[in-house]
Amino acid sequence: DPLPTESRLMNSCLQARRKCQADPTCSAAYHHLDSCTSSISTPLPSEEPSVPADCLEAAQQLRNSSLIGCMCHRRMKNQVACLDIYWTVHRARSLGNYELDVSPYEDTVTSKPWKMNLSKLNMLKPDSDLCLKFAMLCTLNDKCDRLRKAYGEACSGPHCQRHVCLRQLLTFFEKAAEPHAQGLLLCPCAPNDRGCGERRRNTIAPNCALPPVAPNCLELRRLCFSDPLCRSRLVDFQTHCHPMDILGTCATEQSRCLRAYLGLIGTAMTPNFVSNVNTSVALSCTCRGSGNLQEECEMLEGFFSHNPCLTEAIAAKMRFHSQLFSQDWPHPTFAVMAHQNEN
């Protein structure tokens, strides 16, 4: 997939920043706001921000610039630089009027067909589980295979370096074609097929990628919020996998929720399947020792483990993946729309 260029974004933060630099007032305000970072700690939802007056003034000046409302893209070049600008500007939007974080990522729906050659799968036993089949589809694709091997190497061995492993995982889920990445991770298993479930759970190399001792979930979030990329992915996830009501309806499309979920893999907030017998997912953290923030911690943890929007999005994608192999397609090579199961 070609990386999206800035020009393809409606209002890229990189472009907006360049425009701002050409305007002395905007440029000064931006620099001032940027230097406010140390004096304005990013507040967690339970905290009220304390904002110096000069920072408020700088924020006010930026409110009329094109930086307000600027966005980034998950697959763009210089993504981290774009996100840095976004979060600097975000303070201008929310200072003195703390709003819930808004996803920095612009919605783009890909309708590019995904070509798969299923005929090559006949080297597998006919009764092979679907996780094996999707792994084979990745192997048969040069790019997917190369990226998968890269994280496989980084995440294996008794002395794997977790930060290197995470970086390679992040690269895989960012650069591999979305259907390949989703097929690999969200492959369906028969209810009693523990081998298949184990393979699926091990897709992200949890022994290396996940912390050996589960940290407190709020500490994990604090760590995540200190990194623009992780913070962006978490906010994107909370935006698009938010259950709108008690029926668990997703606030946006299920496909958008899944994209946001996969975007977390390789960050500090990497989720995974809990067991090899079902498709329940969770963060690798605990709410023990949260003191008077227990309620807030449980809400964060529950957003992963007890989220009917996410559960149904995963289930729908797995049903879709099952259908790929259960239908008699007219030709061994066929095209599947990448966004076929949006609701």
């Epitope: 259950p243 009501d245 008690i246 029926l247 668990g248 079902n278 329940s280 309620e295 449980e298 809400m299 529950g302 483990s305 007890h306 989220n307 009917p308 929007c309 559960t311 289930a315």
Partner: antibody
Amino acid sequence: EVQLVESGGGLVQPGGSLRLSCAASGFTFSSYAMSWVRQVPGKGLEWVSAISGSGDNTYNAESVKGRFTISRDNSKNMLYLQMNSLRAEDTAVYYCAKTKFSSSLLFDYWGQGTLVTVSS
Amino acid sequence: DIVMTQSPSTLSASVGDRVTITCRASQSISWWLAWYQQKPGKAPKLLIYKASSLESGVPSRFSGSGSGTEFTLTISSLQPDDFATYYCQQYNSYSTFGGGTKLEIK
């Protein structure tokens, strides 16, 4: 410590009205969906009504649709159930219940209940 | 509406026994199932949620299993305090409760 205290129950004639209240404390009230669940003495539990944390969305069981209205006042940490056109089969202990997670009707805390008797 | 069928409706057992209560849903509810314990004159108490997650503060002798339409609550070694009525509840689509299982002393 989470506390839910119901009030407003009593004896009412068929066709009459009653308003139940539930005072909540010990948690961030506006962050959670709340619900009313009833139980005919000596019988099982029946979910009656629910309301989202913001109060924007309400949900009712078929048996009470058009007759019962759930509402909340987040500034006072109060939950209400307005019951109109009451029938004998509405006789039950009514419990106010807090959801464990905002997006599902799973109840981790319950009040002590208030008895509503509909009889002539 | 999803109908929850609990069995048995009454169960006689002794302290130290291992007991199992079953709950069947009329259609798949994934793992959105909870178990509650209720004692006479008291409000129900949450024991298990998401089919197998133990609620904080609940003794580990209580466990839950199952997914789809078949679920079980197991008490590994009955204690005197466990004699009560147990209800299953689905919360996959709104909420419905099973008819209850009264666990009494043999």
